[in-house]
């Protein structure tokens, strides 16, 4: 069982390989000096049907380096960064893992592209392994919370409340969604 030629890459090179390309072979992509690699650099020859070989993912791309590009802090609810730190320049990558009791959907790594957006795939999502969710928390007068546009929330996540200037937060600032589907505290209030 073998794979066909690896997908080509513009403005870059593919690591050395011999043919036929055996299942288990890894090929690696790199870009010319003025270009930045966007996407996973390593492709693996696998077989899904024990008959034909196929590459396990699409090839990355080489983008012309844009020194003005910068990407915003990527947020994955229920997840955390295991690699990557601000500032995020063109070609920088961030890798995520999920918190305990969350499982990942999608690709764990994303790259800062020339268009100031993370890619080439969407940010991963971390899905709660618990079926229970906490109901949406109410807004508070003269205050805000971090999940204004989110409905129900998965266990393990938290909501942070804050007050407008001139108001004092009374109660818990951070409320956690418990595995029971209940919140760890009642919402606080904002008092003058």
């Amino acid at each position: 069982i073998s794979c066909g030629s690896p997908p080509p890459i513009l403005n870059g090179r593919i690591s050395y390989y011999s043919t036929p390309i055996a299942v288990g072979t890894v090929i690696r992509y790199s870009c010319s000096g003025t270009f930045r690699l966007i996407g996973e650099k390593s492709l693996l020859c696998i077989t899904k049907d024990k008959v034909d070989g196929t590459w396990d993912k699409p090839a990355p791309k080489c983008e012309y380096f844009n020194k003005y590009s910068s990407c915003p802090e990527p947020i994955v609810p229920g997840g955390y960064k295991i690699r990557g730190s601000t500032p995020y320049r063109h070609g920088d990558s961030v890798t995520f893992a999920c918190k305990t009791n969350f499982s990942m959907n999608g690709n764990k790594s994303v790259w800062c592209q020339a268009n100031n957006m993370w890619g080439p795939t969407r940010l991963p999502t971390c899905v709660s392994v618990f079926p229970l969710e906490c109901p949406a928390l109410p807004m508070i007068h003269n205050g805000h919370h971090t999940s204004e546009n989110v409905g129900s929330i998965a266990p393990g996540l938290s909501v942070t409340y804050s007050c407008e200037s001139g108001y004092l937060l009374v109660g818990e600032k951070i409320i956690n969604c418990l595995s029971s589907g209940k919140w760890s505290a009642v919402p606080p209030t904002c008092e003058e």
């Epitope: 690591s15 050395y16 390989y17 288990g24 890894v26 690696r28 790199s30 390593s42 693996l44 696998i46």
Partner: antibody, heavy 119, light 106 residues
Framework: QVQLVQSGAEVKKPGSSVKVSCKAS????????ISWVRQAPGQGLEWMGR????????NYAQKFQGRVTITADKSTSTAYMELSSLRSEDTAVYYC????????????WGQGTLVTVSS | EIVMTQSPATLSVSPGERATLSCRAG??????LAWYQQKPGQAPRLLIY???TRATGIPARFSGSGSGTEFTLTISSLQSEDFAVYYC????????FGQGTKLEIK
């Protein structure tokens, strides 16, 4: 960090086989590849082969092709290396080493297993 | 197999001084090179990967450079714990190691 714990030292007769185990703890066994690297006394490091446990795919260095078999048991997070038709030149410390995904470099190593081949 | 050649075989340097170790690949390997440190009776330890990226927990005095066929590991100010054997390893095409450089106290 992933810990790799290998089986104990072995003394073998020429012509026989040896099977060394490498148990991983921490991390996800299915998300990495395990290589076997050996080091003869006072010598350098020599790559023998590697397995990607989630796929069950093993590949071998040409020098060891037909004489080495690398397997993995996902249920126990353990990789195995069996070397057959042993000769005195196979006396070495055998290491298992882990590469995250298919990065190509080894973040974690087992403590090594000394295999002595002697009549 | 890509042949990796390290030089010198033995390097004698005084503590506090700078050490420069070389590794040459038999063919172009881009930046697919790692450096390891090995002390007697121990397994190797990853220092540098992708030719110049320090592994987690490795002190800043260790730095790697080079691409293509010529690579260098530099230890800026040698500490007593740095005297060991150093290996380079390529992962452009499967895997192979250099024969090692022994760094000893002068």
């Amino acid at each position: 960090q992933v810990q790799l714990v290998q089986s104990g030292a072995e003394v073998k007769k020429p012509g026989s086989s040896v099977k060394v185990s490498c148990k991983a703890s921490g991390g996800t066994f299915s998300s990495y590849a395990i290589s076997w690297v050996r080091q003869a006394p006072g010598q350098g490091l020599e790559w023998m082969g590697r397995i990607i446990p989630i796929l069950g795919i093993a590949n071998y260095a040409q020098k060891f092709q037909g004489r080495v078999t690398i397997t993995a048991d996902k249920s126990t997070s353990t990789a195995y290396m069996e070397l057959s038709s042993l000769r005195s030149e196979d006396t070495a410390v055998y290491y298992c080493a882990r590469e995250e995904d298919i990065s190509g470099y080894y973040q974690d190593w087992g403590q090594g297993t000394l295999v002595t081949v002697s009549s | 197999e890509i042949v990796m050649t390290q030089s010198p075989a033995t390097l004698s340097v005084s503590p506090g001084e700078r050490a420069t170790l070389s590794c040459r690949a038999g063919q172009k390997i881009s930046s697919y090179l790692a450096w390891y440190q090995q002390k007697p009776g121990q397994a190797p330890r990853l220092l540098i990967y992708d030719a110049s990226t320090r592994a987690t927990g490795i002190p800043a005095r260790f730095s790697g450079s080079g691409s293509g066929t010529e690579f260098t590991l530099t230890i800026s100010s040698l500490q007593s714990e740095d005297f060991a054997v150093y290996y380079c390893q390529q992962y452009e095409y499967w895997y192979s190691f250099g024969q090692g450089t022994k760094l000893e106290i002068k």
